[in-house]
């Protein structure tokens, strides 16, 4: 807490400008009006304030808005956002995607902090669902964002938003998350033709059931081994040797290199040796 002291004569701030960097902490507290600061927040980022000076500015805003900052101030917080705690952010009501983008820009290049996680949570809850524009924005800043959500949170993602998802956004998703996302993707891409559909659905297939894999095996999709290795064990095990051969096409030879790894290992154990021998790969059940 900065002590309440009178502002020295002639030092009362008329606007937020470079001259304030020479003010001591107590002078900033005494001489900068909180309402002026709130209306000129956009100028703060252009001024090289020290961390200690930013603490004073934050303190002034906290006093002015004890129930939480208005969005007009939040949008222009800039580097002052890094001074906010998750508790501060929980008081906010952020509705504009532009505000969200502005604050994410401040944290760009860093891992998702608790502050950013809280901000995103407040924003998404305020919107009621994870719409396409929001998902586009969040995955652009944090490619792993989607996989940081619980299956319950993912259930609020509308199928239309799935179009915004890139393969790399799913890299760290676990099977339970893909179980939720796959049916949405199937719905989103249902009107595409065979080859285009497979390109889009491929990265979601870790959530696909056996019957969908069987259907794909009839479409000459030539699934690569990396995708096959991410399929659910319970979805792969019922597939016949012929179905796996059709599903993988020319990539079937890759099974040999993966024979010690799941789910290939479990699938091999399930097959009759005579059937495995038809592949000519030397796989032993």
């Amino acid at each position: 807490e900065v002590e309440k002291t009178a502002c020295p004569s002639g030092k009362k701030a008329r606007e937020i400008d470079e001259s304030l960097i020479f003010y001591k902490k107590w002078e900033l507290e005494a001489c900068v009006d909180a309402a002026l600061l709130a209306t000129q927040m956009d100028r703060v980022n252009a001024i090289p304030f020290t961390y200690e000076q930013l603490d004073v500015l934050k303190h002034k805003l906290d006093e002015l808005y004890p129930q939480g900052y208005p969005e007009s101030v939040i949008q222009h917080l800039g580097y002052l956002f890094l001074k906010m705690s998750p508790e501060d952010i929980r008081k906010w009501n952020v509705t504009s995607l532009e505000t969200l983008k502005a604050l994410l820009e401040v944290n760009k290049g860093h891992e998702m902090s608790p502050q950013v996680a809280t901000l995103i949570d407040r924003f998404v809850k305020g919107r009621g669902q994870l719409d396409k524009d929001t998902l586009d924005t969040l995955t652009a800043f944090y490619p792993g964002y989607l996989c940081s959500l619980s299956p319950e949170e993912l259930s609020s993602v509308p199928p239309s938003s799935i179009w915004a998802v890139r393969p790399q956004d799913l890299d760290t998703c676990d099977p339970r998350q893909l179980d939720v996302l796959y049916p949405k993707a199937r719905l989103a891409f249902q009107n595409m033709n065979g080859s285009e559909y497979f390109v889009k659905i491929q990265s979601f297939l870790g959530g696909a059931p056996t019957e969908d894999l069987k259907a794909l095996s009839q479409q000459n999709v030539s699934m690569d081994l990396a995708t096959f290795m991410k399929l659910r064990t319970d979805a792969v095990l019922p597939l016949t040797v012929a179905e796996v051969q059709k599903l993988l096409g020319p990539h079937v030879e890759g099974l040999k290199a993966e024979e010690r790894h799941r789910p290939v290992r479990d699938w091999i154990l399930r097959q009759r040796q005579d059937d495995l021998d038809t592949l000519g790969l030397g796989l032993q059940g």
Partner: antibody, heavy 119, light 107 residues
Framework: QVQLQESGPGLVKPSETLSLTCTVS??????????WSWIRQPPGKGLEWIGY???????NYNPSLKSRVTISVDTSKNQFSLKLSSVTAADTAVYYC???????????WGQGTMVTVSS | DIQMTQSPSSLSASVGDRVTITCRAS??????LNWYQQKPGKAPKLLIY???SLQSGVPSRFSGSGSGTDFTLTISSLQPEDFATYYC?????????FGGGTKVEIK
């Protein structure tokens, strides 16, 4: 529900063969969804997987023990067994048998049996 | 062999604490990672399978996350019965391997 019970001698002499049997009750060793494993734990140390067997007789062993280990299955008796040859004091441990369900993991364990290697 | 490295090897915590244990694989194991709890003189008990799925009968305060090489077991609010040793285990490669264990002790 499925239960596992280890049996075998608690004391084995150095250079001899350690033999243990695991009896499966309440379920079948011929289940297509399960592998049957042996795992051991030396006193005060961590867990070490020894190997598994599938009902078909297909096996897989820990590379560090492979030359000394044999796991077999007897579907008629609903049992699987472990043989570890040329034992030394370093093989002294609690030996567990466990079911490895392909969809989950080692979801059912025996209570473990302490085997001491000493002359 | 795939090496599994757990950290910390031991930790002291109080009832009600949030506890996090990490497990790192020497190469990608997809989501084929299980967590076990073991109490002295008892066989291990499966808590989490496939990195994040809660085994039937296990309290919801236990949760798992991760994929690839980095995994986490979290106990949201430590209970007296949770003081034990925890092990991670990979089943991706046919040569199964366990982590070295993390002993959770009372502070």
């Amino acid at each position: 529900q499925v239960q596992l019970q280890e049996s075998g001698p608690g004391l084995v002499k150095p250079s001899e063969t350690l033999s243990l049997t695991c009896t499966v009750s309440g379920g079948s060793v011929s289940s297509r969804d399960d592998l049957w494993s042996w795992i051991r734990q030396p006193p005060g140390k961590g867990l070490e997987w020894i190997g598994y067997i599938y009902y078909s007789g297909s096996t897989n062993y820990n590379p560090s023990l492979k030359s000394r280990v044999t796991i077999s299955v007897d579907t008629s008796k609903n049992q699987f067994s472990l043989k570890l040859s040329s034992v030394t004091a370093a093989d002294t441990a609690v030996y567990y048998c466990a079911r490895d369900n392909v969809f989950t993991g080692f979801d059912i364990w025996g209570q473990g049996t302490m085997v001491t290697v000493s002359s | 062999d795939i090496q599994m490295t757990q950290s910390p090897s031991s930790l002291s915590a109080s009832v009600g604490d949030r506890v996090t244990i990490t497990c790192r694989a020497s190469q990608s194991i997809s989501s084929y990672l299980n967590w076990y709890q073991q109490k002295p003189g008892k066989a291990p008990k499966l808590l989490i399978y496939a990195a994040s799925s809660l085994q039937s009968g296990v309290p919801s305060r236990f949760s798992g996350s991760g994929s690839g090489t980095d995994f986490t077991l979290t106990i949201s609010s430590l209970q007296p019965e949770d003081f034990a040793t925890y092990y991670c285990q990979q089943s991706y490669d046919a040569s199964y391997t366990f982590g070295g264990g993390t002993k959770v002790e009372i502070k």
